[in-house]
């Protein structure tokens, strides 16, 4: 009982003047609060609280459930307490079976005793199973039994409070311990797509998945460099005891160009934080950008193969692609495929395979592509390199020797004279006239060159060589001279 010092308010006095009282079930509880400024009696046990404004608390027939702490309070807010045990052989424990423990914290198994004189007040596993070896507990007859430093492994542990009463072990109702996990790692966050490309007016929707050990993980969508609260919708799942998942879906029903930017899904718990971002790009309309993978001017040798390759970005998806040559559309020899199988891929490849090209197949090859918003094209100028071919070699009526050769690139014609029967002609002869015959014709295909020399300059028997050559190769034609007296008897051209 409190000691009184005169001149300052003192706590009330309780009769009987004890800190604890043991009453047999069915007997009377009579408690008197002595204080001129009496306010109330309060009774507490487990979660139950009762009040009484009479200064004498009387319970005529005490029950086990009347076990608990009785507190008398005066007008100064000072109080005194007595703890009453109502001994009931049929009800040794008062129980609140709700049992939750936070991992690494202590938790109370609420099974206060109605008889403080029993022995071996402790915890036991259900159905005779032993408690975990590392489980430590501290009994308190007035409150229950405290489990020290709860482990996650104790989750769903079934246990009883136990005590020996008159040499016999008595068990309480069973308790199932539910462990609330402590955060020992940052949340795991992921996003449905890392980037989004949309046209104005289209819906933007992105989902962030947050995984953690419990639902108390915090998460939010944030717009980088903005404080605006974004509208989110949620779904959640418990995949077992310590495996929680939340999906936070952010939606902009009609995206605008100025909605473009980086959106962050942020999550944190008491251990730390994690985030993941997604990028939104909103364009006012679709687009196609074509990138040639080879030079758009192509030189290829006669009979060889060439692949015309383009990469292109198309948004929205390409709808029509074609390769065209001389107003004709290729139905085969080409393929078109996405650069990656990624769902957000906008890059594609198109390849036209030209095989064993002939000199006549040079020209402009055009790739055309379109989507619902735009069309785009790119042209390749293909030049087929061909070895010169001597088309004609003649002696003209005016005494000129003429050689006409075709090839690509433009052939050069050189003339040589070989005296007698020598086949190696070394002395070069300057032409009197050289013309490119089709310079104003179509830009592709063979170029025709005509070259002439004056045969009157030759005074001896021999051979004249007309040699046409370019980067690809060379071809020659020959004129044989035979003199009879002062006359050129005959000129035999041969290749």
């Amino acid at each position: 009982q409190p000691s009184v010092s005169p001149g300052e308010p003192s706590p009330p006095s309780i009769h009987p003047a004890k800190s604890e009282l043991i009453v047999r079930v069915g007997n009377e509880i009579r408690l008197l609060c002595i204080d001129p400024g009496f306010v109330k009696w309060t009774f507490e046990i487990l979660d139950e609280t009762n009040e009484n404004k009479q200064n004498e608390w009387i319970t005529e027939k005490a029950e086990a459930t009347n076990t608990g702490k009785y507190t008398c309070t005066n007008k100064h807010g000072l109080s005194s307490s007595i703890y009453v045990f109502v001994r009931d052989p049929a009800k040794l424990f008062l129980v609140d079976r709700s049992l939750y423990g936070k991992e690494d914290n202590d938790t109370l198994v609420r099974c206060p005793l109605t008889d403080p004189e029993v022995t071996s007040y402790s915890l036991k596993g259900c159905q005779g199973k032993p408690l975990p070896k590392d489980l430590r507990f501290v009994p308190d007859p007035k409150a229950g039994i405290t489990i020290k430093s709860v482990k996650r492994a104790y989750h769903r542990l079934c246990l009883h409070c136990s005590a020996d009463q008159e040499g016999k072990s008595v068990l309480s109702d069973k308790f199932i311990l539910k462990v609330r996990p402590a955060f020992k790692a940052v949340p795991v966050v992921s996003v449905s797509k890392a980037s989004y490309l949309l046209r104005e007016g289209e819906e933007f929707t992105v989902t962030c998945t947050i995984k953690d050990v419990s639902s108390s993980v915090y998460s939010t969508w944030k717009r980088e460099n903005s404080q605006t609260k974004l509208q989110e919708k949620y779904n959640s799942w418990h995949h077992g005891d310590f495996n929680y998942e939340r999906q936070a879906t952010l939606t902009i029903s009609s995206a605008r160009v100025n909605d473009s930017g980086v959106f962050m899904c942020y999550a944190n718990n008491t251990f730390g934080s994690a985030n993941v971002t997604t990028t939104l790009e909103v364009v006012d309309k679709g687009f196609i950008n074509i990138f040639p993978m080879i030079n758009t001017t192509v030189f290829v040798n006669d009979g060889e193969n060439v692949d015309l390759i383009v990469e292109y970005e198309a948004f929205p998806k390409p709808e029509h692609q074609q390769w065209i040559y001389m107003n004709r559309t290729f139905t085969d020899k080409w393929e078109d495929y996405p650069k990656s199988e990624n769902e957000s891929n906008i890059r594609y490849v198109s390849e036209l395979h030209l095989t064993r090209l002939k000199g006549t197949e040079g020209g402009t090859y055009t790739f055309l592509v379109s989507n619902s918003d735009v069309n785009a094209s790119i042209a390749f100028n293909v030049y087929v390199n061909t070895k010169p071919e001597i088309l004609t070699y003649d002696r003209l009526v005016n005494g000129m020797l003429q050689c006409v050769a075709a090839g690509f690139p433009e052939p050069t014609i050189d003339w040589y004279f070989c005296p007698g029967t020598e086949q190696r002609c070394s002395a070069s002869v300057l032409p009197v006239d050289v013309q490119t015959l089709n310079a104003s014709g179509p830009p592709f295909g063979k170029l025709v060159v005509q070259s002439s020399i004056d045969s009157s300059a030759f005074k001896h028997n021999g051979t004249v060589e007309c040699k046409a050559y370019n980067d690809v190769g060379k071809t020659s034609a020959y004129f044989n001279f035979a003199f009879k007296g002062n006359n050129k008897e005959q000129i035999h051209p041969h290749t």
């Epitope: 199932i176 539910k178 915090y218 939010t220 919708k233 949620y234 959640s236 799942w237 005891d241």
Partner: antibody
Framework: EVQLLESGGGLVQPGGSLRLSCAAS????????MSWVRQAPGKGLEWVST????????YYADSVKGRFTISRDNSKNTLYLQMNSLRAEDTAVYYC????????????WGQGTLVTVSS | DIQMTQSPSSLSASVGDRVTITCRAS??????LNWYQQKPGKAPKLLIY???SLHSGVPSRFSGSGSGTDFTLTISSLQPEDFATYYC?????????FGGGTKVEIK
């Protein structure tokens, strides 16, 4: 003592709106998730919506998504359900209920308020 | 969405009978299952949470069991005040869903 008191029910035409309130006493709203559950005449219980203790997370049944909005005013210790674009099939008694936490079920319920959608 | 199927939809029993109601989930809900009792014109009351934990103040004749997809509510000895409709509800994932209910009537 924990008490939940719903109000705001009544007769409304299809396409109309209604705002239900649930005044909570005996506990602090911010400490608990809160839910709305409805029961059509003669039918079973249907979960409608839940708002987390922090108010940060809201969950909805597919049947009301985009039409109903759950919210709370912690200063008034009051839960709300804003119901727009109401349909005849939304006719029901609407209960607000407290989630006891840690997925222990809805431990306290209000007495319910009747919403009738009819032309 | 997870579907909850209760059976039977109704049953007749006498005071003192042992009554069993089952609830089946369309997918694994672990032990995230609650049982409620509702009397006509009244709000539902929580009986069992987390599949087997008795809510505070609920008589011990009520018990719950099960995990995963199959759950049972048992009333060991039916009392006059137990005649009501019983609902199961999963709180494993949103949208949370209720079973169709089981009406327990007097035989």
């Amino acid at each position: 003592e924990v008490q939940l008191l719903e109000s705001g029910g009544g007769l409304v035409q299809p396409g109309g709106s209604l705002r239900l309130s649930c005044a909570a006493s005996g506990f602090t709203l911010t400490s608990y998730a809160m839910s709305w559950v409805r029961q059509a005449p003669g039918k079973g219980l249907e979960w409608v919506s839940t708002i987390s203790g922090s108010g940060g997370y809201t969950y909805y049944a597919d049947s009301v998504k985009g039409r109903f909005t759950i919210s709370r005013d912690n200063s008034k210790n009051t839960l709300y359900l804003q119901m727009n674009s109401l349909r005849a099939e939304d006719t029901a008694v609407y209960y607000c209920a407290r989630d006891s936490g840690y997925d222990r079920g809805l431990d306290y319920w209000g007495q319910g308020t009747l919403v009738t959608v009819s032309s | 969405d997870i579907q909850m199927t209760q059976s039977p939809s109704s049953l007749s029993a006498s005071v003192g009978d042992r009554v069993t109601i089952t609830c089946r989930a369309s997918q694994n809900i672990y032990t995230y299952l609650n049982w409620y009792q509702q009397k006509p014109g009244k709000a539902p009351k929580l009986l069992i949470y987390d599949a087997s934990s008795l809510h505070s103040g609920v008589p011990s004749r009520f018990s719950g069991s099960g995990s995963g997809t199959d759950f049972t509510l048992t009333i060991s000895s039916l009392q006059p005040e137990d005649f009501a409709t019983y609902y199961c509800q999963q709180s494993s994932s949103t949208p949370y869903t209720f079973g169709g209910g089981t009406k327990v009537e007097i035989k």
